[in-house]
């Protein structure tokens, strides 16, 4: 498929790359699996070549995508395999500790259970985890002490605390307490919830609906869940099996997802429903070996092999010996597209079908017998100086017209014989023997040696090459492993180590990463090469849609903290603020808290009272005591706001009651009486014959004996009674109860008399008051 056009017409972004405009130019934006200006190269970093936590970077080397490693601390080399000289190489961590490098000279040991200290050299008394039930073990001298959690006690925290025995009970609002090991459980009434039944039960708060379901209250204590597509159950806890009635074809296996399903296809098929045929010939350039031709078929492929090869992928050398006609007793050796018959003694010919005439020694002694490979007849090769069919005639070889030395050998005549000086590659008395360069077995790895003039040729077994077949053919040279698979060269074959996400002989099959249902929270999974993409439902994000989108970022709450929910948020307002976004400042002055005319100023979750002079306190509720200095001389001080008022005693006036009123000012004494001023009054000194207060009256009011139990004193225009003991009142007519003051002591009983009292004493006491 052609990618989108990018930059120049005709150029395309390959391998799923997207053409995007940036900074006024167009460029290919590649998926993670490919790199390069047109996304033409597999990403070399996908196979994670950098070891020991090294970081892989894609680099361009003469137009080809390659990688470079940035090594972590303590490592170097192209793949970060070589440790630099560092502290961890000195094996500082004892007793099975693991060394972590901090700098090249500093390290930290991670000690196994039972050991501690910088080098894991100290035995740990807490190693056996003696403190049960989450108790914290602290080494103490040569032993340990357990700090137990609240639910357990005892030296090793093994004794359960019965929380239900506490008073008052832990379960509120009529909840029933059940003690459990290490905890307790409250069974609440329908109206309450919470660990201790402390909260009124509000349906949907919190929501019991799982997998993103939406909760709706249906009553005071009931709810129902509206589930996301793909889920069911009272609380949406069940993933609906979407596989029944699936469309997976051609042997594809259905894998259930969330509100969807995926088809896991057999190697020959691909596509969403395994309906698309995999073109193995395009996918695997080396599907047919040894020059075979690949033909794609529906649901597979087949190979048309060249002469001499067979098998599904043309990897098997045809055994030509199976149909060979080597005669009985001959040994057949298979070659590529041919065979060779090794004859037994006495037989000859290509198929060992001829009797070897040399067996009967027809040639004269000293002659050499050769067999004609066509008819099996003997050919006598005579020694120097002899001729004839059986080499029985002596010859002067060199004087003959034909040179007796074969293969252009130089003839040197000798008595009764001759010698030949042979050219290179030949030997024997007549240079008739082609030197057999195969004698030294120069061909390695079971190859067949072909002797040639002055040289040899090795016919190699499959998988080997070179003059001596000494080179193991690099079957990896053609880079047969797809998707950045690592090719391992073997004898006449190769093996692909596939990167994560790919499988098959050539790493040609994309593993269906959606099969494990990696996408969470109702997300849809889209499979890709060595990857998958999750399409998230509303409110979720992250590679696996595992992250609840934080609607609290950016923080929408003006004056409060944000609590994230699924596709929503709640603002928990700071004291003094309200509103959906805590944007409204509550006016604390609206309740008019400032007393005594104080002015209120609103603040954050507070108010400030500015008090009038003479008042104080947060709410101006305290009226300062202006009477504290006792300003009223002869009167009672009444405190006011920022001041006081004096209520004067009779006879005094002025703002501080410090002026004695002159009652004589109005001349109250008549008939020549002299006035003497007093406090709140006056006294008239009357001339003789006048006696009432203002010297007006001449009458003696005592004449009528008004005082019943007392003596009468005449006064100006009136009288006064001086009462007898035990009596009181204006006219001494009220009998006083002298017993009121409990005068009788030591348990004596008091009896009130007309004048006085009488004590009746207890035994052993006497006297007027039993004292």
């Amino acid at each position: 498929a052609r990618g989108p056009r990018c930059s120049q017409p005709g150029e395309t972004c390959l391998n799923g790359g997207k053409c995007e405009a940036a900074n006024g130019t167009e460029a290919c934006v590649c998926g993670g699996a490919f790199v390069g200006p047109r996304c033409q190269d597999p990403n070399p970093c996908l196979s994670t070549p950098c070891k020991n936590a090294g970081t892989c970077h894609v680099v361009d080397r003469r137009g080809v995508a390659d990688y470079a490693c940035s090594c972590a601390l303590g490592f170097s080399g192209p793949l970060c395999l070589t440790p630099l000289d560092n502290a961890c190489l000195t094996n500082p961590c004892r007793n099975g500790g693991t060394c972590d490098l901090l700098t090249l000279t500093e390290y930290k040991c991670r000690c196994p259970p039972g050991w501690s200290g910088k080098s894991c050299q100290q035995a740990d008394p807490c190693a056996s985890n003696p403190c049960a039930n989450g108790g914290q073990c602290l080494p103490f001298e040569a032993s340990y002490i357990c700090h137990c959690p609240p639910s357990f006690h005892g030296p090793t925290c093994r004794q359960d605390v019965n929380e239900c025995g506490q008073k008052p009970g832990l379960c509120r609002h009529g909840g029933t307490c059940h003690n459990e090991v290490g905890s307790y459980r409250c069974v609440c009434r329908a109206t309450h919830t919470g660990p201790n039944c402390e909260r009124p039960y509000v349906p949907c708060s919190p929501s019991p609906c799982q997998n993103g379901g939406t909760c709706r209250p249906t009553g005071d204590v009931t709810h129902e869940c509206a589930c996301l597509p793909g889920f069911t159950g009272q609380n949406c806890e069940e993933n609906i099996d979407d596989c029944p009635g699936n469309n997976c074809k051609n042997g594809g296996a259905c894998v259930d997802g969330v509100n969807t399903y995926n088809c896991r296809c057999p190697p020959e098929w691909t596509g969403q429903y395994c309906t698309e045929d995999v073109d193995e010939c395009q996918l695997m350039p080396n599907a047919c070996q040894n020059g075979g031709t690949c033909h794609n078929t529906h649901g597979g492929y087949n190979c048309v092999c060249v002469n001499g090869w067979t098998g599904e992928d043309c990897s098997e050398n045809i055994d030509d010996c199976a149909s060979a006609a080597c005669f009985h007793g001959a040994t057949c050796h298979d070659r590529v597209a041919s065979f060779y018959c090794e004859c037994p003694h006495g037989r000859t010919g290509l198929l060992c079908h001829l009797n070897d005439a040399c067996i009967s020694n027809p040639c004269n002694e000293g002659s050499n017998c050769d067999t004609n490979p066509v008819n099996g007849k003997a050919i006598c090769t005579c020694p120097s100086g002899y001729t004839g069919p059986a080499c029985s005639q002596d010859v002067d070889e060199c004087s003959l017209g034909a040179n007796p030395c074969e293969h252009a050998g130089k003839c040197i005549n000798t008595l009764g014989s001759f010698e030949c000086q042979c050219l290179q590659g030949y030997t024997g008395p007549r240079c008739e023997i082609d030197v057999n360069e195969c004698v030294s077995n120069p061909c390695q790895n079971d190859a067949t040696c072909l002797d040639q003039i002055g040289e040899f040729q090795c016919i190699c077994m499959p998988g080997y090459e070179g003059v001596h077949c000494e080179v193991n053919t690099d079957e990896c040279a053609s880079s047969p492993c797809l998707h950045n698979g690592r090719c391992l060269d073997k004898i006449n074959e190769f093996q692909c180590e596939c990167p994560t996400g790919f499988t098959g002989h050539l790493c040609q099959y994309d593993v269906d990463e959606c099969a494990s249902t990696p996408c969470k929270n109702g997300a849809k999974c889209l499979d890709g090469p060595n990857t998958y993409t999750c399409v998230c439902t509303e409110g979720y994000t992250g590679t696996h849609c595992e992250v609840d989108i934080d609607e609290c970022d950016p923080d929408p709450c003006h004056y409060g903290s944000c609590k994230d929910g699924v596709a929503t948020f709640t603002c928990l307002c700071r004291p003094g603020y309200t509103g959906h976004h805590c944007e409204t400042n509550i006016n604390e002055c609206s309740s008019q808290p400032c007393r005594h005319g104080g002015t209120c100023q609103d603040r954050d979750n507070a108010y400030l009272c500015f008090c009038l002079k003479g008042t104080t306190g947060p709410n101006c509720e305290i009226n300062l005591d202006d009477c504290a200095s006792s300003p009223c001389d002869s009167g009672t001080c009444l405190d006011k706001i920022d001041g006081y008022e004096c209520a004067c005693e009779p006879g005094y006036t002025g703002s501080m009651c410090n002026i004695n009123i002159d009652e004589c000012a109005g001349n109250p004494c008549h008939n020549g009486g002299t006035c003497e001023d007093g406090i709140n009054g006056f006294t008239c000194r009357c001339p003789e014959g006048y006696h009432d207060p203002t010297c007006l009256s001449e009458v003696n009011e005592c004449n009528s004996n008004p005082c019943v139990h007392g003596a009468c004193r005449d006064s100006l225009n009136g009288y006064k009674c001086d009462c007898d003991p035990g009596w009181s009142g204006t006219n001494c007519d009220i009998n006083n109860n002298e017993c009121e003051s409990n005068p009788c002591v030591n348990g004596g009983t008091c009896k009130d008399m007309t004048s006085g009292y009488v004590c009746t004493c207890r035994e052993g006491f006497s006297g007027p008051n039993c004292q």
Partner: antibody, heavy 116, light 115 residues
């Protein structure tokens, strides 16, 4: 280039203490440990311990625990080794070495003879 | 038994290969051990040659000729220093070293004589 210059030869009586110094140059003193290795006449090498000039942390061979002191003075780029309670078998050439785990650069050695 | 054992001497002809062994005590894991090799000529301090842990974790010190290489023989629980094409200047003592239990341990040394 890296150099480790050691103090001169010493002749000591049994029971006394010897102190050898090792002045370094050509690299950052705190980037490597200073190891001490000795070699008795005609014998093999014996590692004694190292000091980390960064924090004066030391590590000893168990054999020398208690009578070996190693220090590093970063202001003078100098390491020192002190061996107490000397005995005749402490007669050896004492080397200071720069390295971490690989004992890469060696001083020329200081000959210490213990004899009554 | 010594932690590291080296044969006391070894002879080699010029141009031949010499293989020096450093046998680890049986309780020490060869696979996880990193073996360091040093050369010492008479009257001189030792010289660091190389360290060998595996083919991917080996390190020839700068200036050391490439004829020196490290390897391991798992069947003998031994580290090996190979000098391929021995030269007369290679006549020296050779010491192996490992880090064991937080400390450094040397072998007894092997004297190499070039014939």
């Amino acid at each position: 280039q890296v150099q480790l210059v050691q103090s001169g030869a010493e002749v000591k009586k049994p029971g006394t203490t010897v102190k050898i110094s090792c002045k370094v140059s050509g690299y950052k003193f705190t980037d490597y440990y200073i190891h001490w290795v000795r070699q008795a006449p005609g014998k093999g090498l014996e590692w004694m311990g190292f000091v980390d000039p960064t924090d004066d942390e030391t590590r000893f061979a168990e054999k020398f625990q208690g009578r070996l002191t190693m220090t590093a003075d970063t202001s003078r780029d100098t390491a020192s080794m002190e061996l107490s309670s000397l005995r005749s078998e402490d007669t050896a050439v004492y080397y200071c070495i720069r390295g971490i785990a690989a004992l890469a650069d060696w001083g020329r050695g200081t000959m210490v003879t213990v004899s009554s | 038994q010594a932690v590291l054992t080296q044969p006391s001497s070894l002879s080699a002809s010029p141009g031949a290969s010499a293989s020096l062994t450093c046998t680890l005590r049986s309780d020490i894991n060869l696979e996880t051990s990193r073996i360091y090799w040093f050369q010492q000529k008479p009257g001189s301090p030792p010289r660091y040659l190389l360290r060998y842990q595996s083919d991917s974790d080996n390190n020839l010190d700068s200036g050391v000729p490439s004829r020196f290489s490290g390897s391991k023989d798992a069947s003998a629980n031994a580290g090996i220093l190979l000098i391929s094409g021995v030269q007369s200047e290679d006549e020296a003592d050779y010491h192996c070293m490992i880090w064991h239990s937080g400390g450094s341990v040397f072998g007894g040394g092997t004297k190499v004589t070039v014939l």
